[in-house]
């Protein structure tokens, strides 16, 4: 299936060029997606091309500025928040990064009744987060670890927590392994829907060991970075979760929520809260073993002024075959009836489908179902819900909106994007209003992205928000690769993969092959999205056919595939690479004297180890801040998937699964090993021990460190790293530079 | 810059009540979400009273149970009635869209509640 044709015609060849790496390196092909900031049901904020911040109303069809460029400029602006009592707004400024969603930041309150800022009582800096209440213009925001609490603005804060501090107690804010492998947020705190109380979560790292590494900088003597992060097998943080009333915020001070005692006799996690209504809330919550997760409802008992989380109204998710949920285990979406909810989890065929939970998990109504799965709920109202999935023409890797009614019997469902614009959209997210009155699509392909709104009872397209018209005239002349995506089926297994063609592919030539890989659990890279990055480039102008393939492990095509590589993670990614390269190669347009495989991160682990995998395919290789033993990550995400390192559970397939024991097996391949100093995700240590380990096997490699670069390798580092990625391709293919 | 036009002020005893009026110019709809504000002597401007464009209203502390905002979609009009006035709200009374067009403030109308 050919997404993207290309455009060439003999009449045109010499006015079409190919793309170049300056055109990658430089984003000139980059495309913008337009998600309305929701206001109502009918209105919502965007920040114009001039840094006006502009309120749009669907129903009047006008817009007005509420906040000037110009306002934004005199305090560097680069973020801003309206109250929900449309009085004020924040304004971010002096944005600091921390890990993959952390950032400091310091906060400006504007009052746009009188057009000028809020004086006395101003705001410390620098703030780790902040947020409006739901209701109002309450304030909740952390520093220093710990959480305060305005009524307004302008009033003096009042202190709910104490005891934090840096790298040992996190209040209202993750901890690192939180944050990068459970909430996936730079937030723990939570408004109830009317902001009359606050959850938190209290993260205690006292007793988790500390990874250091060297920040070289500019100083004479590096400074040392340390963070509590917690290997595969370490010492846990310790979660509680408090919630206090924030009318009343020192009457009774923040209340502790029960832990189910079935998660609490072992080492647990807690994984998400869901406000139900201001006095129902839902937790989450995971043993360490994460293949059991308890749903606990609460209630706010007045006479008590307590929570009481009744064992009647804990819900039991378990897995047989894996780990509980995909990535993630799926949080509940409420109903109008504030007690029963629908979910995503396995069904009796091991496909990821939405239920409606009404009193027991046993007794769940199944609400979608087939041989594909539900991926995401978007919104339910009274009579719909709304959620993505990749059913339409039995295509994994696209994803469209559907509605379910369900406030007639039998439900019916209809498939809002299937056929709206089907060659360009094929992958689709939707964004909506209250009551999902109005909403927004974005397309991300496979043809030049498209954003558009949408009215939420008739689905009729209101208007284009954003088309990329500019970006479609750019690639005009340009000769972009042909891509198509297929699947192998090999021995009872499907094999999806997406092939990127040279612009003048011709069937009967030899072209060289790049694998690229990621492979994680969970993971998908064989999507229908329109990208031009490196790969096209590779494509366009040095002529290579670049394939990427899903294996076992992958996602949204069952749990037989998921969680085929349960506590052996390193096997079956890399089997599946391979299977894919020898059917390649047995298509007749591959040279099999040129063949190579790349990937970051998860990637560089199973790029790592096929180059080790001793089959001959190979000629070389890249892998970007590789792991290279799974007792050197990250405790929440390896132990999901490998189980512990200890002898009485998995220690021997930790062992048996690093890339040092291959170390042998790289000396007939060209492998280029590249990480950044400052990774606090994937820690320079992996690379360091693989290096060490070829340098003990005399094993000759090239490599390449980015001093002072964390594990995006991101600024001039990136242009640096494809830069030299291209040079060490082309001489591995012989292509002239 | 949008026209809007307040009346309805006026000299009152404390006790008293009073009905401002915004007339609002084609350029704005008064479906939009709309809000009254004011500004008393030697202060700054303060919100009142908004009105959602799905008709919800909310209402600043000091004047709740007292005042009560509305709106006439037909004659693209909002009003505020004010009941039981205190000198304390003696000010000018604006009103606007909610949040505010940005420099698009009326003349105003004056409140004077005398004690």
């Known amino acids: 299936i050919v997404l993207r044709p290309s455009r060439v015609h003999n009449s045109e060849e010499n006015t079409m060029r190919a793309l170049t790496l300056k055109d990658i390196l430089n984003g000139t092909f980059s495309y913008k997606t337009f998600f309305p900031n929701w206001i109502s049901g009918q209105e919502y904020l965007h920040q114009s091309a001039d840094n006006n911040i502009v309120l749009y109303n669907i129903e009047t069809g006008q817009s007005y500025t509420i906040l000037s460029n110009r306002t934004m400029k005199s305090v560097n602006a680069s973020n801003y928040g309206l109250s929900p009592d449309r009085q004020f707004v924040y304004l971010e400024s002096d944005y600091s990064k921390l890990w993959r969603y952390s950032y400091t930041a310091t906060y400006y309150i504007y009052d746009l009744s009188n057009g000028e800022f809020v004086r006395g009582n101003e705001l410390p800096r620098p703030i780790q987060y902040l947020c409006w209440s739901p209701v109002g213009s309450k304030l909740a925001y952390v520093y220093q670890n710990n959480i305060y609490l305005k009524q307004r603005p302008g009033d003096p804060p009042f202190q709910i927590t104490f005891n934090g501090r840096e790298n040992k107690i996190f209040n209202g804010i993750p901890d690192w392994v939180y944050e990068e492998e459970m909430l996936a947020t730079k937030y723990a705190l939570w408004w109830s829907p009317n902001g009359k109380f606050l959850a938190y979560a209290e993260f205690n790292d006292t007793d988790i060991p500390v990874i250091a590494y060297s920040y070289y900088g500019d100083e004479q003597y590096p400074r040392t970075i340390n963070i509590p992060y917690p290997k595969a097998g370490a010492k846990n943080p310790v979660v509680r979760i408090f919630i206090i009333d924030t009318t009343y915020p020192a009457y009774v001070g923040p209340q502790e929520v029960p832990v189910p005692a079935m998660i609490a006799s072992s080492d647990y996690y807690f994984s998400w809260l869901t406000w139900v209504t201001d006095e129902r809330v839902c937790l989450q919550w995971l043993k360490r073993v994460q293949n059991v997760s308890v749903l606990s409802i609460c209630d706010f008992r007045e006479d008590w002024q307590t929570w009481d989380c009744p064992k009647t109204q804990e819900h039991i998710e378990e897995s047989r075959t894996g780990w509980a949920g995909g990535f993630f285990v799926s949080t509940p979406v409420f109903s109008y009836d504030a007690i029963s909810y629908y979910k995503i989890f396995s069904d009796k065929d091991g496909y990821k489908h939405i239920h409606y939970i009404k009193d027991t998990v046993e007794n769940a109504i199944q609400i979608t179902s087939g041989k594909w799965e539900a991926i995401n709920i978007f919104r339910v109202t009274q009579d719909s819900l709304f959620y993505s999935s990749n059913e339409f023409e039995e295509y994994p890797g696209r994803r469209n909106i559907y509605r379910i009614s369900i406030g007639s019997y039998p439900p019916s469902k209809k498939c809002v994007t299937c056929h709206l614009r089907k060659e360009r959209c094929q992958y689709y997210t939707a964004s909506f209003s209250d009551y999902a009155k109005y909403y927004a699509l974005v397309c991300y392909g496979p043809g030049i992205p498209i954003s558009t709104l949408h009215d939420g009872r008739t689905d009729q397209e209101i208007k284009i928000l954003e088309e990329n018209k500019e970006l479609e005239n750019a690639l005009k002349n340009i000769q972009l690769p042909k891509e198509e995506i297929k699947k192998l089926e090999v021995d009872e297994i499907t094999l999806w993969y997406k092939m990127i063609l040279p612009p003048q592919f011709d069937r009967s030539k030899k072209y060289p092959l790049l694998i690229q890989v990621y492979g994680g659990p969970c993971s998908q890279s064989v999507r229908s999205v329109f990208a031009v990055n490196w790969i096209s480039y590779l494509a366009s102008k040095e002529g290579m056919v670049i394939a990427l393939v899903d294996g076992r492990g992958t996602a949204f095509q069952g749990d037989k595939l998921l969680y085929a590589v349960y506590r052996k993670l390193g096997v079956y990614e890399v089997e599946d690479q391979i299977t894919a390269v020898r059917k390649f190669i047995e298509m007749g347009f591959i040279d099999e004297k040129r063949i190579a495989i790349w990937g970051w991160s998860y990637g560089g682990y199973v790029s790592s180890l096929a180059l080790a995998s001793g089959t001959g395919l190979f000629k070389c290789g890249i892998a970007v801040a590789p792991v290279s033993s799974w007792e050197y990550y990250a405790s929440v995400y390896t132990e999901r998937f490998m189980g512990l390192p200890t002898k009485d559970d998995n220690l021997e397939h930790y062992k048996n699964s690093t890339v040092m024991a291959r170390a042998e097996y790289f000396r007939n391949v060209d492998y280029l090993l590249i990480h950044g100093t400052a990774d606090d995700n994937v820690h320079f240590q992996n690379s360091a021990q693989i290096a060490k380990a070829l340098v003990n096997a005399q094993v000759d490699f090239q490599a390449m460190w980015y001093s002072d670069q964390n594990h995006g390798l991101s600024g001039l580092s990136t242009n640096h790293l494809y830069t030299h990625m291209t040079h060490f391709l082309k001489q591995c293919f012989s292509l002239s530079d | 810059q949008v026209q809007l036009q307040e009346s309805g002020g006026g000299l009152v005893q404390a006790g008293g009540s009073l009905r401002l009026s915004c007339t609002v110019a084609?350029?704005?709809?008064?479906?939009?979400?709309m809000g009254w504000y004011r500004q008393a002597p030697g202060k700054r401007r303060e919100w009142v009273a908004t009105i959602t464009t799905g008709g919800r209203t909310n209402y600043a502390d000091s004047v709740k149970a007292r005042f009560t905002i509305s709106r006439d979609n037909a004659k693209n009009t909002v009003y505020l009635q004010m009941n039981s006035l205190k000198p304390e709200d003696t000010a000018v009374y604006y009103c606007?869209?909610?949040?505010?067009?940005?420099?698009?403030w009326g003349q105003g109308t004056q409140v004077t509640v005398s004690s």
């Open positions: 084609e350029s704005i709809d008064v479906r939009n979400a």
């Open positions: 606007n869209a909610a949040p505010p067009i940005l420099n698009s």
